[in-house]
Interface confidence: medium
């Protein structure tokens, strides 16, 4: 193959790739806590969003999905399935509704959602 | 790596690929002829729309980007850079415009706009 | 010539679930999105979401959570149901149909939906 | 979301004046802005669409201009039907978005 492309993965069957991550949208509604699991089935998280420049095709997405990022009421932050909290800049969060998860939107949105709301989702994997 | 995982590719570096398909979205605004060599300068061609099963990630694609769907003014079709013509309920056609060129919109839309308006595009790279 | 008529209640209580439908005369259902818009007395225009023949939709996120919106491609009608209604959302709402990406054309006549106790 | 800021709010003119209006989007939306014109107890109508694009129908004396961030909605020679609430929105992307309104009454 020329010098200028390149393999992506590896990820599971009929995901998308990019930049060595590997992405699903989901098109059934669940609840965040069905929609983790669901992810978590399949090897994987929900989305984290570590990086403008890594992941912007996300720019791209229409519609409003769960990631993996949650509010943490004792001491009011936001942080991600494995425990990191989410970076300064990276979102733009939105209080939409009250609730502790939050939707990925467009251009790097993230919109407050309560929990159990059924929504489509997104998972990610990141490969190694 | 597991059975379930496999490679996707290849592609241009830090293009999204997706069932073996190469796809880039460019942000900056080029006219239908520019984009079209913009995309060949790639060693790729714009955006054929084929299978909404195999290309059901565009779905998702917010806004509104030129793609390789041309007007042959002769005969009334609508058909793709290669020359093959435009199958049925692949794409639905809105004429917005008068034009022979089209702008894909999310969920398989296909809107009619003037060849020499400047629009984002999408390049697409088929892998064997 | 393409032209839009609503209808549904006028008056529902606190908690209640709003339900409006737009009927299409004349001109192509699909291929289309049909959209729902209000606003409120003496305010501006708020987008509330919209619909395609295929039933595929967008929904303004800050009303996401309570609005449905439907598709009967055998009418060409579309549907708006908003749940748990209150006084904030007392406005004239309009169907109308999204002319692809570039504008609303043409609007129904509007019906006032007022939310009191 | 995009948000969209008309000014100004309320505009007083004349028969025969030139009145401009202007809208400004809080990001580049390119030239996807449309404007309406509304009455009083009436649906809004469609005049503009694709920033400078005059619908069927509408009188010359209409234009607009602009494209990225800002944009204009000119009236050549403002007419006695032509007092109204004037709407910019923008169809970049989902949740569309209208200005405020520009209420044009007469001097």
């Known amino acids: 193959i020329p010098l200028t492309e390149s393999y992506c993965g590896p990820c599971p069957k009929n995901w998308i790739c990019y930049k060595n991550n590997c992405y699903q949208f989901f098109n059934e509604s669940k609840n965040w806590y069905e929609s983790q699991a669901s992810c978590m089935s399949q090897n994987a998280s929900l989305l984290k969003v570590y990086s403008k420049e890594d992941q912007d095709l996300l720019k791209l997405v229409k519609s409003y999905h769960w990631m993996g990022l949650v509010h943490i009421p004792t001491n009011g932050s936001w942080q991600w399935e494995d425990g990191s909290i989410l970076s300064p800049n990276l979102l733009t969060i939105i209080e939409m509704q009250k609730g502790d998860c939050a939707l990925y939107a467009s251009s790097f949105k993230g919109y407050i959602e309560n929990c159990s709301i059924p929504n489509t989702y997104i998972c990610m994997q990141r490969t190694v | 790596i597991p059975l379930t995982e496999s490679y996707c590719g290849p592609c241009p570096k830090n293009w999204i690929c997706y069932k073996n398909n190469c796809y880039q979205f460019f942000n900056e605004s080029k006219n239908w002829y520019e984009s079209q060599a913009s995309c060949m300068s790639q060693n790729a061609s714009l955006l054929k729309v084929y299978s909404k099963e195999d290309q059901d990630l565009l779905k998702l694609v917010k806004s509104y980007h030129w793609m390789g769907l041309v007007h042959i003014p002769t005969n009334g079709s609508w058909q793709w850079e290669d020359g093959s013509i435009l199958s049925p309920n692949l794409l639905t056609i809105i004429e917005m415009q008068k034009g022979d060129c089209a702008l894909y919109a999310s969920s398989f839309k296909g809107y009619i706009e003037n060849c020499s308006i400047p629009n984002t595009y999408i390049c697409m790279q088929r892998t064997v | 010539q393409v032209q839009l008529q609503q209808w549904g209640a006028g008056l529902l209580k606190p908690s209640e679930t709003l339900s409006l439908t737009c009927a299409v005369y004349?001109?192509?259902?699909?291929?289309?999105?049909w959209s729902w818009i209000r606003q409120p007395p003496g305010k501006g225009l708020e987008w509330i979401g919209e619909?395609?023949?295929?039933?595929?939709?967008n929904y303004n996120p800050s009303l996401k959570s309570r609005v449905t919106i439907s598709v009967d491609t055998s009418k060409n009608q579309f549907s708006l149901k908003l749940s748990s209604v209150t006084a904030a959302d007392t406005a004239v709402y309009y169907c109308?149909?999204?002319?692809?990406?570039?504008?609303?054309?043409?609007w129904g006549q509007g019906t006032l939906v007022t939310v009191s106790s | 979301d995009i948000q969209m800021t008309q000014s100004p709010s309320t505009l007083s003119a004349s028969v025969g004046d030139r009145v401009t209006i202007t809208c400004r989007a809080s990001?580049?939306?390119?030239?996807?802005l449309a404007w309406y014109q509304q009455k009083p107890g009436k649906a809004p109508k469609l005049l503009i669409y694709?920033?400078?694009s005059l619908e069927s129908g509408v009188p010359s004396r209409f234009s607009g201009s602009g494209s990225g961030t800002d944009f204009t909605l000119t009236i050549s020679s403002l007419q006695p039907d032509d007092f109204a609430t004037y709407y910019c929105?923008?169809?970049?992307?989902?949740?569309?978005?209208f200005g405020q309104g520009t209420k044009v009454e007469i001097k």
């Open positions: 109308a149909r999204a002319r692809g990406p570039w504008s609303f054309d043409p």
């Open positions: 004349g001109g192509s259902f699909s291929g289309y999105y």
């Open positions: 619909i395609d023949h295929s039933g595929s939709t």
């Open positions: 990001q580049s939306i390119s030239s996807w």
């Open positions: 694709k920033a400078s």
């Open positions: 929105q923008q169809s970049k992307e989902v949740p569309w978005t």
